[in-house]
C-alpha cells in the first residue's frame, strides 16, 4: 500500500506516535516519506547482507527476522514480512522499540539527513487529525 501523506499521519497518530519519545508526528511522516515514499512494501538490500523493510525501512540485522540475515538479533520479535503489511501496526511497534533504544530517530538515516532540523510540521499541515 502507498499511503497518502495525511492518511499516514492519521494512522501514525492513532498508534500513538505523535510526540512519542518527544518526536512530533511530522518527524515520523517525514521519515516515512524519505525512507519509503510512504510505500509499505518497500524493501532495500544493504551491502552487509541485511535488508530494510516497510514504510520505515526497518533493518533485519537488528530488528526483525527475515531468515537470511546472518546474526540477526530480531529485537522487535517479529518476522520482517510483518513490516510489509498494509496495516502499519508492526512497523509502528517496532519503531517505538527502535526510538526508545538510545539514539532516538537518529537510527533512521533518511530522518537524520532530510528531516532533522527542518520544518517537519509541514508534513502534517492541512491534515485533519
Amino acid at each position: 500500500k502507498v499511503f497518502g501523506r495525511c492518511e499516514l499521519a492519521a494512522a501514525m497518530k492513532r498508534h500513538g506516535l505523535d510526540n512519542y519519545r518527544g518526536y512530533s508526528l511530522g518527524n515520523w511522516v517525514c521519515a516515512a516519506k524519505f525512507e519509503s515514499n510512504f510505500n509499505t512494501q518497500a524493501t532495500n538490500r544493504n551491502t552487509d547482507g541485511s535488508t530494510d523493510y516497510g514504510i520505515l525501512q526497518i533493518n533485519s540485522r537488528w530488528w526483525c527476522n527475515d531468515g537470511r540475515t546472518p546474526g540477526s538479533r530480531n529485537l522487535c520479535n517479529i518476522p520482517c514480512s510483518a513490516l510489509l503489511s498494509s496495516d502499519i501496526t508492526a512497523s509502528v511497534n517496532c519503531a517505538k522499540k527502535i526510538v526508545s533504544d538510545g539514539n532516538g530517530m537518529n537510527a533512521w538515516v533518511a530522518w537524520r539527513n532530510r528531516c532533522k532540523g527542518t520544518d517537519v510540521q509541514a508534513w502534517i499541515r492541512g491534515c485533519r487529525l
Epitope: 500513538g16 520479535n77 511497534n93 522499540k97 526508545s100
Partner: antibody, heavy 124, light 102 residues
Framework: EFQLVETGGGVVQPGRSLRLSCAAS????????MHWVRQAPGKGLEWVAV????????YYADSVKGRFTISRDNSKNTLSLQMNSLRADDTAVYYC?????????????????WGQGTTVTVSA | SYDLTQPPSVSVSPGQTANITCSGN?????GCWYQQKPGQSPLLVIY???KRPSGIPERFSGSNSENTATLTISGTQALDEADYYC??????FGGGTKLTVL
C-alpha cells in the same frame, strides 16, 4: 490450542501478600504482551497491569501501583503477579490475558486469549 | 468512575441491529470490545476499532469516530445476550453494557 491457566488465588487477610501465576501454552509466549485483569463480584472488568515483550515496559492501574508487581519468565512461559498490602477492595476474580497483536511495544490493541480466572478473597 | 462511558443497558429485538456506544478521549487512539456471559471469561469480539478475531461472526462490527467507539451487532440473536465492555489502548475499560435480546 492457545491456553492460559491461572493459579495462586485464595483467601488472605488484609495487609498480607499473595502471588498469582499464569502458565501459557500453544503460542510463542515471549513475543506477546501479557495482562492481568480483575473483576470484583457483580462488577465490571478492571485492568490491573501489563508487561510487554520488552520487559522494561510494565504499566499498572493507579489502584494497584506500588503494591502489585507484574513479571514474566519467558523460559518457563509464566506470567506472575505479586500482590502486597492487600485490601478488601482487591477481592476479585483475576484473569491473565494475552495481547492480540504480536510484539506490541507499549500499547494494547485488545486481549484475545484469556484464562479461566483465579479467585482472590481479602477478608479478616 | 470510568474513563470510558457506556450505557448501562441496551435492549433489542431478535433479528434487529444493536448499537452499543463507548465514549472517551482515550478513544482518539484505538478501541476494542469484549463479550462476557455469566460465569465465563471475556471474549474479544472487535479490536483496533473494526477488526474481528477469527471465529467471531460477521454480524459483529465496530467503528470509531470523534472519540466514540460503536459496537454494532446486526441480526441480533438470543445467544448475543451478554455484557459488553469497551477498552482503550492503555487498558482502561468502560463500565459495561448489558445487552438484552427481548
Amino acid at each position: 490450542e492457545f491456553q492460559l491457566v491461572e493459579t495462586g488465588g485464595g483467601v488472605v487477610q488484609p495487609g498480607r501478600s499473595l502471588r498469582l501465576s499464569c502458565a501459557a501454552s500453544g503460542f510463542i509466549f515471549s513475543s506477546y504482551g501479557m495482562h492481568w485483569v480483575r473483576q470484583a463480584p457483580g462488577k465490571g472488568l478492571e485492568w490491573v497491569a501489563v508487561i510487554y515483550y520488552d520487559e522494561n515496559n510494565k504499566y499498572y492501574a493507579d489502584s494497584v501501583k506500588g503494591r502489585f508487581t507484574i513479571s514474566r519468565d519467558n523460559s518457563k512461559n509464566t506470567l506472575s503477579l505479586q500482590m502486597n498490602s492487600l485490601r478488601a477492595d482487591d477481592t476479585a476474580v483475576y484473569y491473565c490475558a494475552r495481547d492480540v497483536v504480536v510484539a506490541a511495544f507499549d500499547f494494547s490493541y485488545g486481549m484475545d486469549v484469556w484464562g479461566q480466572g483465579t479467585t482472590v478473597t481479602v477478608s479478616a | 468512575s470510568y474513563d470510558l462511558t457506556q450505557p448501562p443497558s441496551v435492549s433489542v429485538s431478535p433479528g434487529q441491529t444493536a448499537n452499543i456506544t463507548c465514549s472517551g478521549n482515550k478513544l482518539e487512539k484505538f478501541g476494542c470490545w469484549y463479550q462476557q456471559k455469566p460465569g465465563q471469561s471475556p471474549l474479544l469480539v472487535i479490536y483496533q476499532d473494526n477488526k474481528r478475531p477469527s471465529g467471531i461472526p460477521e454480524r459483529f462490527s465496530g467503528s470509531n469516530s470523534e472519540n466514540t467507539a460503536t459496537l454494532t451487532i446486526s441480526g441480533t440473536q438470543a445467544l448475543d445476550e451478554a455484557d459488553y465492555y469497551c477498552q482503550a489502548w492503555d487498558g482502561s475499560f468502560g463500565g459495561g453494557t448489558k445487552l438484552t435480546v427481548l
